[in-house]
Every structure is written in C-alpha cells, then in structure tokens.
C-alpha cells in the first residue's frame, strides 16, 4: 500500500476554495481513505472519510472527489478561513 501527496504547500486567499490531491496504491478490495488536519500541537484532527465503493463524500466545507479507477482522492475545502492554515494528510485503511 502506498499514499502520495505531491503538493508540498499551497497558498490560497480566504473565502476561496482549495483542492489537495492524493494518489494511492492498494491491493485491498475494500478500503477507506481518510483526510486529517494536523494542528501546530501535532494533534491530528479527522476531517472526512471516503469509502472505496461509495459516492463522493461530503461533510460541511469538506468534500472529496474520488476517482477510483485512477486511485485519486482529492479533498476540497471551500470558503477558506484563516484557521484552515495547517498541514493535511491523507491515509489509507481497511
């Protein structure tokens, strides 16, 4: 299993939307992709989960664009706020 986030940093003005990309590889049939936000304290905050055979996930300002065949799962954060400034991680799990 492998997860790749090619964007090292992104800068975007408030109130705009940003899309963070994540590519993965897996041999699992059934899996989840999780998106987390890391606080300055290093604490990880769960944001949203995408199931491998589910429709695109959405939760508040967070939405996922899931391309299963391409093994791509992008997180879009809309209406950006200053407190969205952070490090974001995607993770793969069964």
């Amino acid at each position: 299993q492998k997860v790749t986030q090619a964007q090292s940093s992104v800068s975007m003005p408030v109130r705009k939307a940003v899309t963070l990309n994540c590519l993965y590889e897996t041999s699992w049939w059934s899996y989840y992709i999780f998106w987390y936000k890391q606080l300055p304290s290093k604490e990880m905050i769960f944001l949203i989960r995408q199931g491998s055979d589910e429709q695109n996930a959405k939760s508040g300002r967070y939405s996922v664009n899931f391309k299963k065949a391409a093994k791509s799962v992008a997180l879009t954060i809309s209406a950006l706020q200053l407190e969205d400034s952070a490090k974001y991680f995607c993770a793969l799990g069964e």
């Epitope: 049939w29 199931g51 055979d53 589910e54 429709q55 391309k67 299963k68 065949a69």
Partner: antibody
C-alpha cells in the same frame, strides 16, 4: 444537464482500427473519470477500462489491454477509445459512462454500434 | 474478478404480480447496483447502493441484500416494467455486471 454524446455507428473491415468518441457536457469534464463498456448478446456488459481526463491516468480490464486505448481531450471535453486489430468479436455496442465516486454509473452515452465485417 | 450470476434469466409475470430477481456474487461485495435496459436504449440507473432508488424510479421497486446475495423486487408489476435488469458491483478493483434478467409480461 449531463449529456454524453457518442459518435455514430461504424462499419469497418477486419484488421483495421477505429476510434470512438464521447463528448461530455453539463458538468466539469476533468472532475470525473470516463469509463467504457462493451455490450454483446453473448457476453453481456463488460467493463473495458477508464480514464481520468485530468491526469490521463488509465485503468484497463486485462481482457482489453492491447485492444483498447483510452484518451481524453480536455479542451473539447471529449473522451476517445481506439480499438485496434479488429475482428468480428469486436462487433458490439460500446458505451461511455460516468461513475458516481466509487459507486454506480449514473450517466450513460447513447451507445455506438460497431460492426466488423468484410 | 467478481462474477455476478443473475436468476432467473427470464421472468414471466402478469400485471399486478409481485416478482423478485436475484444476483449472486462469487465473493462478498459491499453494495449492489441495478440498471434497467429496454431494447434499443442505454441501461438506466435503477437502484444504487443496494436499496436506493434512482431518480424517477417508481416506489414499487425495491432492492435488498448483503454479502453475496442481492435482490430486486417489484411489488406490483406494470407493463412499463418489461425490460432487462442488470446487477453491477464495484467492490473489487474493476466493475462487473451480471448477465441480466429479462422481465416479460404475460
């Protein structure tokens, strides 16, 4: 509204190649993969493969590797499938279809009928 | 890849009758999707994620199941329901379809 407009019926000779097209409208083309399916009376519906128009990343059913080549043109919002070394076994109706995440296929083109005959 | 087996291949029913068609998967899947196809037309999404009716599908249709066994039921068949119904899964790496159940009205 979402529409997938496929090219017209084709009659081609054995051994030749053909390219089928699928023009998407009513949504942002690069936000969704485009998949292709083959339908015949004998084998029913068979998944051929898919392309991510944004990146060009493709995935194929092993059965159709070397037979089908998927491409996409972002500027015209059109997906293409080239079928090579055609035989009578390739005679079928081909559909381009758009998935909803990793779930089902919510939009289908009207289909292109391919007939391979000498 | 996961093989989907649909039964019966042909289902004959009278208007008003209750009918059930089944789809069995060679391995366990999380969801099953169903499509309706009439001659000369593309398949239409009919039931998705096992039990959710697609837009415009009459409430007499329902879907159920889990694991390797799924079904589509019509509570009271109407003439317009005559069509072929296909099941589809995408729990494995590639989508697969069943061979279809053709519903004929007497």
């Amino acid at each position: 509204q979402v529409q997938l407009q496929q090219s017209g019926a084709e009659l081609v000779r054995p051994g030749a190649s053909v390219t089928l097209s699928c023009k998407a409208s009513g949504y942002t083309f690069v936000d969704y993969e485009m998949h292709w399916v083959k339908q015949t009376p004998v084998h029913g519906l068979e998944w051929i493969g898919a392309i991510d128009p944004e990146t060009g990343i493709t995935a194929y059913n092993q059965k159709f590797k070397g037979k089908a080549t998927l491409t996409a043109d972002k500027s015209s919002s059109t997906a293409y499938m080239e079928l090579s070394s055609l035989t009578s076994e390739d005679s079928a109706v081909y559909y381009c279809i758009r998935p909803r995440g990793g779930s089902h296929f919510d939009y289908w083109g009207q289909g292109t009928t391919l007939t391979v005959s000498s | 890849q996961i093989v989907l087996s649909q039964s019966p291949a042909i289902l004959s029913a009278s208007p008003g009758e209750k009918v059930t068609m089944t789809c069995r998967a060679s391995s366990s899947v999380n969801y099953m999707h169903w499509y309706q196809q009439k001659p000369g037309s593309s398949p239409k999404p009919w039931i998705y994620a096992t039990s959710n009716l697609a837009s415009g599908v009459p409430a007499r249709f329902s879907g159920s199941g889990s694991g390797t066994s799924y079904s589509l039921t019509i509570s009271r068949v109407e003439a317009e329901d005559a069509a072929t119904y296909y099941c589809q899964q995408w729990s494995s790496h590639q989508p697969t379809f069943g061979a279809g159940t053709k519903l004929e009205l007497k």
